[in-house]
Every structure is written in C-alpha cells, then in structure tokens.
C-alpha cells in the first residue's frame, strides 16, 4: 500500500526510539569511520525531519525515498573525501545507484581499534550518568564493525545489553553479574553477525533465488507439520525481510520482520506446535525467539518420497509445468523428512535431482533414466557424515586448542596465500564446531556443524574478496554456495605456494605476551603456527608440534623469570635457531 | 601406549655425581617437552627440571639450578639428567615423565605419562 511519505509512515510503524536506533545504524553500517557525535547529530536532523513529515505528510521532501533521504543526508559529511577516498564519488550518483555504490563499499574487516573493555565501575558510571549516550554507543560501535549486522536483531542485543546493567549495576558483586552477562553477548553477537553475512552474502552473490532454496529447506525441518503452500508464504516473506536488510533498507526490514512475527503467531496452528512461548513474549524477544525454534516434531506416517518424485509417470510432465515449484516441493518434502541432514546437503540433493530431471526429461526413456535417482544421494550424504565423525574423534582426542592447531596447519597448507590474522580467526573458529556440535547425538551433529561450517566459510570468503589472493579460494568461494564446504575438504597442500622467506623478526617475542589473557596468548601461539607452516609448508606434523612445544616452554619459562625482557631475547635466540635447525630453514 | 623407563639410580657421597637416563617408547616423545621430578619419602613429588621437545628451552627449580643440567637424544628417544655437587637433601625417587602438551610445565599433573621411577640416595 502507497504511503505519500514513506518516513512518516516507517516512523509511526517503528515508533521514535526504534526509528532512531534503526537509522543510527544503518549509518554507522555505512559511514563505518565516522565518530559517534557526527552520527548522533545527523541522526536528530533526521528524526526531526521525519516528525515534520507525520505531522504533514505532504510538506517539503517528505515524499522522497529513504535512500534519496538518507543517501543526501550521509553525503552532507564534511570529510567524505577524505577518510573514505573513493567512496565519495557515490555522491555524484542518484538513486538506486547511489544507494548500490554505498553498500559496495561497506569493510567487513574496517581499520578499527579493538572494543576494550572497561572497568566495571566506569561502565555502570556512564550508563547512570546518559543511559541513552551509553547504549547508542553501543549500537554504533557493533553496527560500524559489522556491517552487515541483522539490524532488528541488534535492537534486541542492546535491550539485553540495557538490561544487564540496569540489574548488575545495582548488584552487591558487579563484576561477577555483570561480565560473564556481556561476555555470553559478545559470544552470541559475533555469531549472529556471522550467520547474517552468510544469508546477505547468498542473496547478494547467488542470487533470490538460491536465498529462498536455502530458506525452504530450513524453514521444512523446523517446521514439518505446515503445508507447503504455508511454508512457500513464510519464505516469500522471509526473503523480503532479508534482502531489504542485507540492502540497508532497515526500517523497511524492521517494519516486515515485525509483520512476519505478528503473522506467525496468528497462525500457530497451521505452522507449528513449539510457537507458543515465543508468541507471548514482547516484539523483539518474539522474532528472535521464533528465529530459534526447535525443530516441530514430524507428522506420523509421511509417505516415500519416491512415490510422487522417481515412480510417478508425472514426473516430467509436473517438472516441465513449472520447475521451481516442483523442486520447491521436493525440497520441502525431503527436508521435513530429514531434520537430521545439515541444510546444505539437502541443497545438495535438491541440486542432484534438478540436474538428473533436466537430463532425464530429454531423454528416450525418462522414467528409466531417472528411476535411480536417490542411489545418487547416498555418496553425498555419506561424505559429511564421514567427516563429522572423523573430526568429532580428532575434537575429542585433541581438545579445543590442539583441534584448532591442526585445522590451522591443514587450511594454511591448503591455501597458504591467505594473510596469517584471516588464517588464524577462521581455523580457530572452524575448530569450535568440536565444541559446539560433537556433543550432539548423531542426529544433531550434521545440521549443527555443517551449516556452523558454512557460516565459517563465508567469513573466510567475504575477507578474501577484499583482498584476493588465492584462485583457489576465490573458486571455492563464487563455484557453488552450497558445495563451499566440500571444496574446501578437498583442496590438497598447495603445491605452487612458494615458501614464505625467514624472517626472524616473525619469531621473536617480548614480554608484553605475558600480560595477555589466555586467548590472546593462545592467538599469538597460533600465529606463530602459521607462519611456521608458511614458511615450511612441507613440515611434518611431528615438527610443527615439536616446535610449538619448543614455544610453549619458552613463554611459560620468561614469563616467570626475574627479567623477562632480558630472558625473551636470549631463549629467543636459542628459540629460533632450534627451530630453523628442526626445520631446516 | 608411551612407556618411560629410567636408570642410573644409586648410593652416592655428598659432593659426588650421577647421571639419570629415561628412555621413552612411542613417537610423541619427540613432540613433548620432557621433564623429571623427584619424591622424598614422606614428601610430595616436587619438579626437579623439564626440557621442551626440540631441546632449546631447559628450566630447572631453585634447589637444583646451577647443579644439575637437562639434555634429551631425539634420535635415541632418551632424556637425561646430569646431576652434580649432589646434597643429602636430594635423596629420593627421581621419575623422568612426558607433558601432555598443553599445561604448566612445573606441576606434576599435566604430565601424563611416568616412569617407575630410580631411587637416588646421597649419604653425608
């Protein structure tokens, strides 16, 4: 429905305080150099624009666009030019284009100093002082680093956050109320940062219609008792609220999230049976809750699948009448089926089948030709089971870090052009699937790690886009979204990677490690691993853990002496020429 | 399964010398730091010295430093402990031990594999 001025309209839907949150963010998303006071202010200019247009819809510019209105608004910044260089020449363009070179130059690795936590006693000060200042704050400096964070979604991270120091900051231990609070959000925060990159970075590189594949697939497993014709209506919806986020349109996006929830929980019945906590709770609590569901428990007595897609006689004929429907239904139904398979390999399968249906429905004889159809699925859905249980036995043998370590070396060999900090970020968070999914029973352990695993990957390919370094990875990363994981699994040791030339200065190590907590350490140990590998990709496992021992010890050591600095530059020498005569470099 | 056995154990003068030898059976030797601890009778098992996989890095409590000196043979899958200006106070059994590769390296539980130990007796 036409609204004569889409600002007013998103401003009464959202209410003032979300209106000015969503835009704080989608300018942060944006301008992700500029300091928070410049945001603010042009935030207010427009908030008090947008009162202007509800209380008259048809005064001056109140019938522009949001992107004509934002885009003229961002391009008021004085210092365009210079901290953002290029970006600036989006400024001569008009809408849509203007809009499109704006998302082209969002960082998702933007030159930003790390988030350094205060002192507990300093944050709830500056909450009590402006508890307004305190969580826009907040909502800039996550929107800025991620910027393509689920912009709703944050709303709903700042009201935890909000809430975690209105309750602590009156507690007798602060600290110990407070911290683990805000470490469970950095946690959960980074995760859904990562899993939104992935959906934008499918809508944006393969297109809607590989988004709404993805979503059918998911949206069938948890929730396996609504009819097809349901499950079709939620993911138009869905995808509508994703590619509006993924395209900077937030209020729009904040707004349809908001109608989608209201939808679901009117329609309980015809969805599923786990809806019914999440629908009492407030907006933002329910989209989220509804966004986490458990899986619905599956209808009893569902019927092959081979009777309507391998023996029907129909099967070209309903194919032929319309493709994406039919595999659409395919998918559905193999999906509520199968809870227990990773999202992706029911792509996979749903690809198989499309692929064997083009071929086949040319052929002599169809229903021959393609009456084997689901033998072709067993290697497929074989190939991650294999894998997961392999890597749960690694994960178990090894433990978290040492797992890491090793996934360290296998990708650094794979694809060693890589630069060490992205090499180091994905290997270690490739390892905490182990964690994450080897817990699980066998039915869980392959939704929960190959789709982790494909989140992990897209960050892998969203970095290297910025800067590509390696055809392998770029293959990897544009062939297939869905066979991303595989591609990977299969790469070998590069053998074209010219060795790294030692530098000494890579190794050497001071005593500012000891006051690191011990993740940074660990990252230090890790990088370090890297560059061993880079530098001697043919190192064997036995070496590369030799001298990391070698390391460890040397750490431990210096970190307990008198003189540290003077114990980190002697063992150091030592260190090093070990390491060189164990290697041979 | 890794097996550490250790020698060279004796009756010796104060003042005198002795020589500890561990040999280790399986590959992970070779990847681990190593490390010996002693244990009075009566007393807790108290660390003596480890030294890490490659051999670079050697360290040593303060009641032994400056006397006793680590060495391992990767190619022969053995440590040793060269004990000199041997005190009565260092009469016990003495056990050669493999790090489990990721925890301190001065505390007797994060080695996870131990030899039957060789006692030492020093006489005044």
């Known amino acids: 429905d036409a609204h004569k001025s889409e600002v007013a309209h998103r401003f009464k839907d959202l209410g003032e305080e979300n209106f000015k949150a969503l835009v704080l963010i989608a300018f942060a998303q944006y301008l992700q150099q500029c300091p928070f006071e410049d945001h603010v202010k042009l935030v207010n200019e427009v908030t008090e624009f947008a009162k202007t247009c509800v209380a008259d819809e048809s005064a001056e510019n109140c019938d522009k666009s949001l992107h004509t209105l934002f885009g003229d608004k961002l391009c008021t910044v004085a210092t365009l030019r210079e901290t953002y260089g290029e970006m600036a020449d989006c400024c001569a363009k008009q809408e849509p284009e203007r809009n499109e070179c704006f998302l082209q130059h969002k960082d998702d690795n933007p030159n930003l100093p790390r988030l350094v936590r205060p002192e507990v006693d300093v944050m709830c000060t500056a909450f009590h002082d402006n508890e307004e200042t305190f969580l826009k704050k907040y909502l800039y400096e996550i929107a800025r680093r991620h910027p393509y964070f689920y912009a709703p979604e944050l709303l709903f991270f700042a009201k935890r956050y909000k809430a975690a120091f209105t309750e602590c900051c009156q507690a007798a231990d602060k600290a110990a109320c407070l911290l683990p609070k805000l470490d469970e959000l950095r946690d959960e925060g980074k995760a859904s940062s990562a899993k939104q990159r992935l959906k934008c970075a499918s809508l944006q590189k393969f297109g809607e219609r590989a988004f709404k594949a993805w979503a059918v697939a998911r949206l069938s497993q948890r929730f396996p008792k609504a009819e097809f014709a349901e499950v079709s209506k939620l993911v138009t919806d869905l995808t509508k609220v994703h590619t509006e986020c993924c395209h900077g349109d937030l209020l729009e996006c904040a707004d349809d999230r908001a109608d989608l929830a209201k939808y679901i929980c009117e329609n309980q019945d015809s969805i599923s049976s786990k809806l019914k906590e999440c629908c009492e709770k407030p907006l933002l609590e329910k989209s989220h809750c509804i966004a986490e569901v458990e899986n619905d428990e599956m209808p009893a007595d569902l019927p092959s699948l081979a009777a309507d897609f391998v023996e029907s006689k129909d099967v070209c004929k309903n194919y032929a009448e319309a493709k994406d429907v039919f595999l659409g239904m395919f998918l559905y139904e193999y999906a509520r089926r199968h809870p227990d398979y990773s999202v992706v390999l029911l792509l996979r399968l749903a690809k198989t089948y499309e692929t064997t249906l083009e071929k086949c429905c040319a052929a002599a004889d169809p229903h021959e030709c393609y009456a084997k159809v689901f033998d072709e699925f067993k290697p497929l859905v074989e190939e991650p089971q294999n894998l997961i249980k392999q890597n749960c036995e690694l994960f178990e043998q090894l433990g978290e870090y040492k797992f890491q370590n090793a996934l360290l070396v296998r990708y650094t060999k794979k694809v060693p052009q890589v630069s060490t900090p992205t090499l180091v970020e994905v290997s270690r968070n490739l390892g905490k699937v182990g964690s994450k999914c080897c817990k699980h029973p066998e039915a869980k352990r392959m939704p929960c790690a190959e789709d982790y695993l494909s989140v992990v990957l897209n960050q892998l390919c969203v970095l290297h886009e910025k800067t590509p370094v390696s055809d392998r990875v770029t293959k990897c990363c544009t062939e297939s979204l869905v066979n991303r994981r595989p591609c990977f699994s299969a790469l070998e040791v590069d053998e074209t990677y010219v060795p790294k030339e030692f530098n000494a200065e890579t190794f050497t190590f001071h005593a500012d490690i000891c006051t690191l907590s011990e993740k940074e350490r660990q990252i230090k140990k890790q990088t370090a691993l890297v560059e061993l590998v880079k530098h001697k990709p043919k190192a064997t496992k036995e070496q590369l853990k030799a001298v990391m021992d070698d390391f460890a010890a040397f750490v431990e050591k210096c970190c307990k002496a008198d003189d540290k600095e003077t114990c980190f530059a002697e063992e150091g020498k030592k260190l090093v020429a070990a390491s060189q005569a164990a290697l041979g470099l | 399964q890794v097996q550490l056995v250790e020698s060279g154990g004796e009756l010796v003068q104060a003042g005198g010398s002795l020589r500890l030898s561990c040999v280790v059976s399986?590959?992970?030797?070779?990847?681990?730091?190593m490390g010996w601890f002693r244990q009075a009778p009566g007393k807790e098992r108290e660390y003596v010295a480890h030294?890490?996989?490659?051999?670079?890095?050697?360290d040593y409590s303060d009641s032994v430093k400056g006397r006793f000196a680590i060495s391992r043979d990767n190619a022969k899958n053995t440590v040793n402990l060269q004990m000199n200006s041997l005190k009565p106070e260092d009469t016990a059994v003495y056990y050669c031990?493999?790090?489990?590769?990721?925890?301190?390296?001065?505390?007797?539980?994060?080695?996870?594999?131990w030899g039957q130990g060789t006692q030492v007796t020093v006489s005044s």
């Open positions: 399986g590959r992970t030797f070779r990847t681990r730091t």
């Open positions: 031990a493999l790090h489990n590769g990721i925890g301190v390296r001065t505390v007797p539980s994060q080695y996870d594999s």
């Open positions: 030294i890490s996989a490659n051999g670079p890095i050697t």
